[in-house]
């Protein structure tokens, strides 16, 4: 912390301007006016301060706002924001998504640093939802946001923000995601045409339940195998031969190069071999002929 | 085909909470999403919320705070608890398959249980 | 929340002639609307889905109309099974909400 010493006679700050590059660290504690700095802040950014400068202006402004700086002031730290912990952050209010904006500008380019999740995480318990214009932005700086969020803060997510979200930003999604994601997407594409409905249902559909993919199987989709293969497991075994042919429409053929791995091996191990032979593929492992299928999960539930 | 079958506790004293179970039977509970529904005395249907059989459920914001709903599969069971409960909180409670196979899309309801009377009272 | 409201409240009817029900909603819920039909002691059934498709097993005489907000269910012509209390429930968005029932009688 900086000691209090009077500021030397004629270095008075009237303004935040490039002279107080020359201030010494005590200078600028003395000699900058917190109120002023407060009204000024837009201009720091363009001053290069350096970083033991900007750690003495960030001391004045948490003497001036020890509750948590105002809005008015956080819109404009610019590169401060860097200075700040996920402490100070935590007492902030930010409500304006220009200002969520402007800081997510800061950081643009690297990793989520924990002031950065700080943010967001006041930011949309702030709003209550995460509604389409913010989940716009955080997937714009960070195409992963949606899927470090847990399930419960997926929850969270209203329908109409969906429109909102690209293929991309679920590709690291796991399935409890998608199982929360799956649903509203459904619920929000659900006036759109068959063709339009599956292009943007497609990327979602690590989380629908068979009955789902059976429908969908009856619209001439065309799944292409990448899709296919984030199915869910449990999902995909209860699909009949002639159900996968036509889900899958041409790309069924790409079945071959995957028939080791999950979901299309054990997908393969639950339909009688007869059946397989009928996609001309050469897949192998299905049931053989005159074999009897007891669902035992079925049976354990039934009795 | 496929049933649903109600049951739990009929009479629930006010402040404690209700614990309701739903049995699938005659098919597998993890090819839909199973909804709770509601219809106090006399009047109109309300919707509680709903569960997926990986246990992602969603609910009605009315009843959020109050309300977990919660699934068995080796049971092939979903069940619901709603705490705190008042006079207000007395209805027939029903369970319900949410749509599968004739649309893709779409949040209504095709299969129904009977129902079964809650009756919240000291 | 949406908020269905159905009219009329009760709705007299002879066998034989033509009921219709009417259902709107507080907001546009495009085309996804269900109708039930519900006798005492019985679990709700679904008629209609989609405004104006019918459930498997319905029969003919029952008919679903209309978009955005305003639906008509029409009984063409009343067989003495059909007298129950009608429900009309949106599913454009969550929560799911029901209309508060139109109870069909015999005139």
């Known amino acids: 912390e900086v000691e209090k010493t009077a500021c030397p006679s004629g270095k008075k700050a009237r303004e935040i301007d490039e002279s107080l590059i020359f201030y010494k660290k005590w200078e600028l504690e003395a000699c900058v006016d917190a109120a002023l700095l407060a009204t000024q802040m837009d201009r720091v950014n363009a001053i290069p301060f350096t970083y033991e400068q900007l750690d003495v202006l960030k001391h004045k402004l948490d003497e001036l706002y020890p509750q948590g700086y105002p809005e008015s002031v956080i819109q404009h730290l610019g590169y401060l924001f860097l200075k700040m912990s996920p402490e100070d952050i935590r007492k902030w209010n930010v409500t304006s998504l220009e200002t969520l904006k402007a800081l997510l500008e800061v950081n643009k380019g690297h990793e989520m640093s924990p002031q950065v999740a700080t943010l967001i995480d006041r930011f949309v318990k702030g709003r209550g939802q995460l509604d389409k214009d913010t989940l716009d932005t955080l997937t714009a700086f960070y195409p992963g946001y949606l899927c470090s969020l847990s399930p419960e803060e997926l929850s969270s997510v209203p329908p109409s923000s969906i429109w909102a979200v690209r293929p991309q930003d679920l590709d690291t999604c796991d399935p409890r995601q998608l199982d929360v994601l799956y649903p509203k997407a459904r619920l929000a594409f659900q006036n759109m045409n068959g063709s339009e409905y599956f292009v943007k249902i497609q990327s979602f559909l690590g989380g629908a339940p068979t009955e789902d993919l059976k429908a969908l199987s009856q619209q001439n989709v065309s799944m292409d195998l990448a899709t296919f293969m984030k199915l869910r497991t449990d999902a995909v075994l209860p699909l009949t031969v002639a159900e996968v042919q036509k889900l899958l429409g041409p790309h069924v053929e790409g079945l071959k190069a995957e028939e080791r791995h999950r979901p299309v091996r054990d997908w393969i191990l639950r339909q009688r071999q007869d059946d397989l032979d009928t996609l001309g593929l050469g897949l192998q492992g299905g049931i053989p002929n005159g074999y009897l299928v007891l669902d035992l999960s079925m049976q354990e539930a039934l009795s | 085909q496929v049933q649903l079958q109600e049951s739990g506790p009929g009479l629930v004293k006010p402040s404690e909470t209700l614990s309701l179970t739903c049995t699938v039977s005659?098919?597998?509970?993890?090819?839909?999403?199973w909804s709770w529904v509601r219809q106090p005395p006399g009047k109109g249907l309300e919707w509680i919320g709903y569960?997926?059989?990986?246990?992602?459920?969603n609910s009605n914001p009315s009843l959020k705070s109050r309300v977990i709903i919660s699934v068995d599969t080796s049971k092939n069971q979903f069940s619901l608890k709603l705490s705190s409960v008042t006079a207000a909180d007395t209805a027939v409670y029903y369970c319900a398959r949410e749509v599968g196979r004739i649309a893709v899309a779409g949040w209504f309801f095709d299969l129904w249980g009977r129902g079964t009377l809650v009756t919240v009272s000291s | 929340e949406i908020v269905m409201t159905q009219s009329p409240a009760t709705l007299s009817v002879s066998p034989g002639e033509r009921a219709t029900l009417s259902c709107r909603a507080s907001?546009?819920?495009?085309?996804?609307l269900a109708w039930y039909q519900q006798k005492p002691g019985q679990a709700p059934r679904l008629l209609i889905y989609?405004?104006?498709t019918r459930a498997t097993g319905i029969p003919a005489r029952f008919s679903g109309s209309g978009s955005g907000t305003e639906f008509t269910l029409t009984i063409s012509s009343l067989q003495s099974e059909d007298f129950a209390v009608y429900y009309c429930?949106?599913?454009?968005?969550?929560?799911?909400?029901f209309g508060q029932g139109t109870r069909l009688e015999i005139k």
């Open positions: 429930q949106q599913y454009n968005n969550w929560p799911l909400t």
């Open positions: 907001q546009s819920v495009n085309s996804n």
């Open positions: 569960i997926f059989y990986s246990g992602s459920t």
């Open positions: 005659g098919g597998s509970i993890n090819n839909y999403y």
């Open positions: 989609g405004a104006s």
